[in-house]
Amino acid sequence: AGVFELQIHSFGPGPGPGAPRSPCSARLPCRLFFRVCLKPGLSEEAAESPCALGAALSARGPVYTEQPGAPAPDLPLPDGLLQVPFRDAWPGTFSFIIETWREELGDQIGGPAWSLLARVAGRRRLAAGGPWARDIQRAGAWELRFSYRARCEPPAVGTACTRLCRPRSAPSRCGPGLRPCAPLEDECEAPLVCRAGCSPEHGFCEQPGECRCLEGWTGPLCTVPVSTSSCLSPRGPSSATTGCLVPGPGPCDGNPCANGGSCSETPRSFECTCPRGFYGLRCEVSGVTCADGPCFNGGLCVGGADPDSAYICHCPPGFQGSNCEKRVDRCSLQPCRNGGLCLDLGHALRCRCRAGFAGPRCEHDLDDCAGRACANGGTCVEGGGAHRCSCALGFGGRDCRERADPCAARPCAHGGRCYAHFSGLVCACAPGYMGARCEFPVHPDGASALPAAPPGLRPGDPQRYL
């Protein structure tokens, strides 16, 4: 047993054009009240079919009189929750209808008049004991915002309100085989009431009304020992085998229900309980329409006016999935070029570009050399978002403005002396060395360790290498 609770947050004009006229006027003040109808499962029954899970009516809201010329605002609401008590287990999946009624308070003969302003319906999956679920539903130009939850009434606990809890009899622990009732640790699970007639020796249950058998026992009440002898012996055709039980594959093995449907065994086949938006033997057919509001995160729903046609959600930037339910990590696609840093701001994507690059995706390579002159005959070289000057001989520095000392780096090897020259530098080599940088030793026999000389040159001619 438990209670379904509905909290109406607002009822007023929906977004978009065509705001509805206020339901009340100075001449006809009125007040609102709400009705909720609940049905188990995901049935799309007519609004008139019985509210098998229960129904509730809210109190009347405050009297409202329209201000002339003002657009219809959110209308004043009744106080408190709508509560629908349920006596049996909470089914987990349910259909709801919420109706907004107007009570006119003018000078009607015979008392107030009632008229239906809006009706919204939907199918949802909900575990008892969970947090409040928020929802927005539209009916014509009206929008209803509400929250709902299902909670168990003590001593029932669990997602279906089927486990029972009792205050502890002993202060320290629960009875044999009984667990503490989280989150009420000071209470204990009560023994379950199994199916009537379930064998106390050979049967047990995990849900009320169930009868599960210990190994070696079978039958609906666990009173039949599992026979090792055969109940199918070779004999003539058309043999009746009443009472013969054989093991076999479970009807729901491998879960034949698609799209998250839950499977239950039936004598000849199986039955799928389909999640919101699906129907068919195996929940393989999508029955959601735009009226069900299937698009999340501000997605725009197109199509799906009749139950057999599909709908398409056009997702806003930053969301994807058939129902716009997944947030896109847009930076994972590395949209920023040239090493730019990606920032997903939710409503937009930003690229923070490295120096030398610009554009929404850092795709433009700025002309690094634009307006950058290299002095003294140097040439500008672009690259990596920064400019560089390739300086003429005798000059250096970022812009080739510094006169270079070619001898500063001590380019002459083996003690050779360096002289700056208008064309660069000249090395005067120490005895026994030769070459442009005095890098080659001269051997005593007159040969040198020079590389093979080009044709027409003598290996020992140092002047030609200066």
Partner: nanobody, 126 residues
Amino acid sequence: EVQLVESGGGLVQPGGSLRLSCAASGFNIEYESIGWVRRAPGKGEELVARIYPTNGYTRYADSVKGRFTISADTSKNTAYLQMNSLRAEDTAVYYCARSEYSHYSGSHHYYALDYSGQGTLVTVSS
């Protein structure tokens, strides 16, 4: 009068194939659940395959999954069991039976059989 008559059994080498037939009379198989039950020497019965022709529902025991295929021709009121890649452990008497799911207990699902045929022997041996 309800009758189920199996045929198609015989001796086959490992890796071979057989097709068993189950001709039903006295009821319409389209609206019933038909199963093939086997009894191997020294073992209990096991429902190896099951079909409900109304919705095309089929189920197989793990031991035969991927090798056996159950089917039904409602115009002939006949069910079939196509057995491929046969193994020595498939040797058994195979019965065709009208079956209904009964319950789950002791880690097994159980089926109640109300009518069955006389059985056909399948021997897999080299």
